[in-house]
């Protein structure tokens, strides 16, 4: 199938929260077009799917209600953030992009965005 | 349910220009590509192009470039096809469709045709 | 642009008969994310055309499932259990693996 270049940064942190953003960037031929983003997770020689979302260019991203991801595109790029991270869930989060629509069908695989998440410390109970 | 109505017949003179339009309802206008798609009188189909309802991006067949000029109004769920400098041969049924991704973009619902006669 | 040629151009039936029309493409329809771009649509007389058949031989909603479709990359055939009245109108199979989309030239089912 035809390959497609897809950009995304190669280490992101984790916020407190357990929150990670990045941008996943690809090379699309025009406007017209429908696509499906999926965030993979490979540890261990695993790899799992983490979410994924099909939207047409200019329309909102949408990924199922009880998805951990959520995001916006513009233009060719996508903001995807996931949350709900333990630091169990380091990883690396690989972003492919599959053009749907129109034909013909365009694969794109990223090199994938190691995640680190570390749990928060918590708080020492202060006795007053 | 969904509904894609289109504009009634229309008659032309060769040189002259026809704009077709297509009525989506029951469904989210966004969500789906329509398609336009002619039939000669006892033809075949023929694709002229596809629009997205979103940005109004398009994609057509090299053949009715410089023919046909695809747009759309989200406000009212409407897509529009114009044919400009008509000729004989642009006489035809010229329906819209919607493309659904659950089947990978086959054209599931279609309006009932515009015909559109090009005469002198 | 990718050619369909169906046959044959007009195909009389018994009802309670079975039918068959073929397609044939210029190019493999087969991509290699394993999905096959062929459709089959009908168009009864005085109708739009109503889809059939997705992805080669996946029935869209509402289809009866007397019919059904099988294939290669290049050659296709829809097939038909036991023809109906209602199933009288012209056939054509489509392409979508690349624009432009491009439709066989049709096949004309009719009733003995």
């Known amino acids: 199938c035809k390959a497609m270049h897809v950009a995304q940064p190669a280490v992101v942190l984790a916020s407190s929260r357990g929150i990670a953003s990045f941008v996943c960037e690809y090379a699309s031929p025009g406007k017209a077009t429908e696509v499906r983003v999926t965030v993979l997770r490979q540890a261990d020689s695993q790899v799992t799917e983490v979410c994924a979302a099909t939207y047409m260019m200019g329309n909102e991203l949408t990924f199922l209600d009880d998805s951990i991801c959520t995001g916006t595109s513009s233009g060719n790029q996508v903001n995807l953030t996931i949350q709900g991270l333990r630091a169990m869930d380091t990883g690396l989060y690989i972003c492919k992009v599959e053009l749907m629509y129109p034909p013909p069908y365009y694969l794109g695989i990223g090199n994938g965005t190691q995640i680190y998440v570390i749990d928060p410390e918590p708080c020492p109970d202060s006795d007053f | 349910q969904v509904q894609l109505v289109q504009s009634g017949a229309e008659v032309k003179k060769p040189g002259a220009s026809v704009k077709v339009s297509c009525k989506a309802s029951?469904?989210?206008?966004?969500?789906?590509?329509i398609n336009w798609v002619k039939q000669a009188p006892g033809q075949g189909l023929e694709w002229i192009g596809d629009?997205?309802?979103?940005?109004?991006?398009?994609n057509s067949n090299q053949k009715f470039e410089g023919k046909a000029t695809l747009t759309v109004d989200k406000s009212i769920s409407t897509a529009y096809m114009e044919l400009r400098r008509l000729r004989s041969d642009d006489t035809a049924v010229y329906y819209c469709a919607r493309l659904r991704r659950e089947y990978f973009y086959a054209m599931d619902y279609w309006g009932q045709g515009t015909l559109v006669t090009v005469s002198s | 642009d990718i050619v369909m040629t169906q046959s044959p151009l007009s195909l009389p039936v018994t009802p309670g008969e079975p039918a068959s029309i073929s397609c044939r493409s210029s190019?493999?329809?087969?991509?290699?994310?394993?999905?096959?771009?062929l459709y089959w649509y009908l168009q009864k007389p005085g109708q739009s055309p109503q889809l059939l058949i997705y992805q080669m031989s996946n029935l869209a909603s509402g289809v009866p499932d007397r019919f059904s479709s099988s294939g290669s990359g290049t050659d296709f055939t829809l097939k038909i259990s036991r023809v109906e009245a209602e199933d009288v109108g012209v056939y054509y199979c489509?392409?979508?693996?690349?624009?432009?989309?491009?439709f066989g030239g049709g096949t004309k089912l009719e009733i003995k």
């Open positions: 489509a392409q979508n693996l690349e624009l432009p989309l491009t």
């Open positions: 629009i997205n309802p979103n940005n109004g991006g398009t």
């Open positions: 029951g469904y989210k206008f966004t969500d789906h590509f």
């Open positions: 190019k493999s329809l087969l991509h290699s994310n394993g999905i096959t771009y």
